[in-house]
């Protein structure tokens, strides 16, 4: 079995994780893509996904997760805003290509979120209010809740991550202002 590699990112609560997952342009541009958490014992679980087919540069927000698929660059951008300690864990990008199995994009992201104020540039946090740089218009993709699932296989592209510095920003004093919680029955 291929040894799966990880990139470790240590961030503070309130910061934003910004991940770029590269993929082969021609092959996967319009394929649906997802952000998954790897639970104990190699049990991936989808947290958010793009639309099907995936739209170019169209932000999709699911809770505190924002996905943007840049077809022309062959990369899926994943942001997790207002990070919480509980967000710590192992994550991966996958590409969904029915009827084939999903493809996993390397590297996996080992996210470690710690408590405490960080005054470093790009931390998206100050003492009085949280400032999150978020696309002003986002939609929520309908990730499957109870439809036929598939399992994950591996594919070789790389992923990179850093602390978020997106182009457009909205100043928010309340985290809930930016959380588009899924609509429940």
């Amino acid at each position: 079995a291929t040894k799966l590699t990880e990139e470790k990112y240590e961030l503070k609560e309130g910061q934003t994780l910004d991940v770029k997952c590269d993929y082969t342009l021609e092959k996967f541009a319009s394929s649906q893509k997802a952000w998954q958490i790897i639970r104990d014992g190699e049990m991936p679980k989808t947290l958010a996904c793009t639309e099907r087919p995936s739209k170019n540069s169209h932000p999709v927000q699911v809770g505190r997760i924002i996905l943007e698929d840049y077809h022309d660059h062959g990369l899926l951008r994943v942001r997790m805003v207002n990070l919480q300690v509980e967000d710590s864990g192992l994550y991966q990008c996958v590409i969904y290509q029915p009827p084939k199995e999903p493809h996993m994009l390397f590297d996996r992201i080992r996210l470690v979120v710690t408590k405490g104020f960080s005054g470093t540039p790009g931390s998206n946090e100050n003492s009085t209010q949280n400032v999150y740089k978020i696309p002003p218009t986002t939609t929520k993709a309908l990730c499957p809740l109870y439809t036929s699932p598939r399992t994950v296989t591996q594919a070789p592209p790389k992923s990179t991550a850093d602390v978020s510095t997106p182009d457009s920003e909205i100043n928010l004093t309340n985290v809930t202002d930016i959380i588009r919680v899924p609509v429940f029955n």
């Epitope: 997802a34 998954q36 639970r39 104990d40 014992g41 190699e42 049990m43 991936p44 679980k45 989808t46 947290l47 958010a48 699911v62 809770g63 505190r64 997760i65 997790m80 919480q84 509980e86 967000d87 969904y96 999903p102 990730c143 499957p144 809740l145 109870y146 439809t147 036929s148 699932p149 598939r150 399992t151 994950v152 959380i179 588009r180 919680v181 899924p182 429940f184 029955n185």
Partner: antibody, heavy 122, light 112 residues
């Protein structure tokens, strides 16, 4: 239709091992994670662990670590749960329960086996 | 481990009347994707448990609409708008936010 059929009741002596099977049908076996949950007489539900039938990877509750082994046979669409060093407190009904696989957001157990009663007595 | 606390322990109900069960978790079950990883199950006498509600408030297939789930974070509620005789049994909440999955102690619903 989709169902999980478990093996029959077992009576074991303390210190022995028991192996319970759970045969899946009506769906793609490797696309759904399988959990094991037990219930002591008159008690609540207790999660034991999970197996990914696709690759065979497992994760066990700390309480059962070292005593439980979950395996699968893809050719027969069957998962197994073996519990060793049995003691009287292990007397319970053991259930296998299906969880949606990696692509689905939900983690709920939508299909349950009928349960297997395991009695540990000297 | 995340501890799940259910109340009441026992709930005597009158058919046609509403019923409510509470479930509290020791840690937030709200994930980064906005979903609460909390499910509700009903175990009827002599049967295996059956799924009622998943992800906090989504009714499982075939579950009557008199059942509803609500709540977020650490406080959740299962409501039955009009109890029917067939609803008797033990109700369990379960968290899937963190390993190990843990269940509440159960609430026994019985007809008065």
């Amino acid at each position: 239709q989709v169902q999980l059929v478990q093996s029959g009741a077992e009576v074991k002596k303390p210190g022995a091992s028991v192996k319970v099977s759970c045969k899946a049908s009506g769906y793609t076996f490797t696309s759904y994670y399988m959990h094991w949950v037990r219930q002591a007489p008159g008690q609540g539900l207790e999660w034991m662990g999970i197996i990914n039938p696709s690759g065979g990877s497992t994760s066990y509750a700390q309480k059962f670590q070292g005593r439980v082994t979950m395996t699968r046979d893809t050719s027969t669409s069957t998962v197994y749960m073996e519990l060793s060093s049995l003691r009287s407190e292990d007397t319970a009904v053991y259930y296998c329960a299906r969880e949606a696989g990696s692509w689905l957001i939900s983690t709920a157990f939508d299909i349950w086996g009928q349960g297997t009663m395991v009695t540990v007595s000297s | 481990d995340i501890v799940m606390t259910q109340s009441p322990l026992s709930l005597p109900v009158t058919p046609g009347e509403p019923a409510s069960i509470s479930c509290r978790s020791s840690q937030s079950l709200l994930h980064s994707n906005g979903y609460n990883y909390l499910d509700w199950y009903l175990q009827k006498p002599g049967q295996s448990p059956q799924l009622l509600i998943y992800l906090g408030s989504n009714r499982a297939s075939g579950v009557p609409d008199r059942f509803s789930g609500s709540g977020s974070g650490t406080d959740f509620t299962l409501k039955i708008s009009r109890v029917e005789a067939e609803d008797v049994g033990v109700y369990y909440c379960m968290q899937a936010r963190g390993t190990p999955w843990t269940f509440g102690g159960g609430t026994k619903v019985e007809i008065k």
